[in-house]
Amino acid sequence: YDFTNCDFEKIKAAYLSTISKDLITYMSGTKSTEFNNTVSCSNRPHCLTEIQSLTFNPTAGCASLAKEMFAMKTKAALAIWCPGYSETQINATQAMKKRRKRKVTTNKCLEQVSQLQGLWRRFNRPLLKQQ
């Protein structure tokens, strides 16, 4: 999906008012210096691409974040403020089997959510030069 046509200001507002708090809740009890940010993004569409990937694609050691509140709010924000996003997702996953995942918070998931926090912060500051 090409995130170029999203309403970035509305997504930013959703992040600031809701998603950011849910990410903090998920990370509660974890030191902010515990994980190094290794994932970066260069502009807002790129940031949303990376955010979508880290939020919804299973990775080794972190099978699923999709049942977390921040993930659901991310998905809804993309559906509402990115034209055609939900149709793209429906078509892309039509052949895959629906399955319910157990919510398990692993250290790998915590690291992944820490990366997400960094991506969202970058999304909110699009004019900053890439480090």
């Epitope: 699923s64 999709a66 998905k75 809804a76 089997k97 319910r100």
Partner: nanobody, 123 residues
């Protein structure tokens, strides 16, 4: 599998109001459930448009086109979501669908949704 049934659609004059309901069966939502319930609409020949979402913690999102006119709410005890639609305009005419997301991984339908209810705004 969650089944969703919408009701409350109909013909209304511009400036009027309607309240849509969406009853979910096949799943009981408790105070600890994590889910999204939302509404999207589709007018003939037009792309689907998401209008609103409510989350199990009470947070809500609205599309610009309906903000200030539509209000989404949910009653966990009745497994029902509502969309109160005020100051309706002819451009609000569409089939309205209720949808639910329970955070499935690789969700085959992205969201589960109902059959829809037709809202017609015309004088």
């Amino acid at each position: 599998e969650v089944q969703l049934v919408e009701s409350g659609g109909g013909l209304v004059q511009p400036g009027g109001s309607l309240r849509l309901s969406c009853a979910a069966s096949g799943r009981t939502f408790s105070a600890h459930s994590v889910y999204t319930m939302g509404w999207f609409r589709q007018a003939p020949g037009k792309e689907r448009e998401w209008v609103s979402a409510i989350f199990s913690d009470g947070d809500t999102y609205y599309a610009d086109s309906v903000k200030g006119r539509f209000t989404i709410s949910a009653d966990n005890s009745k497994n029902t979501a509502y969309l109160q639609m005020n100051s309706l305009k002819p451009e609000d005419t569409a089939v309205y669908y209720c949808a639910i997301d329970e955070g499935m991984d690789y969700d085959g339908n992205f969201y589960d949704w109902g059959q829809g209810t037709l809202v017609t705004v015309s004088s």
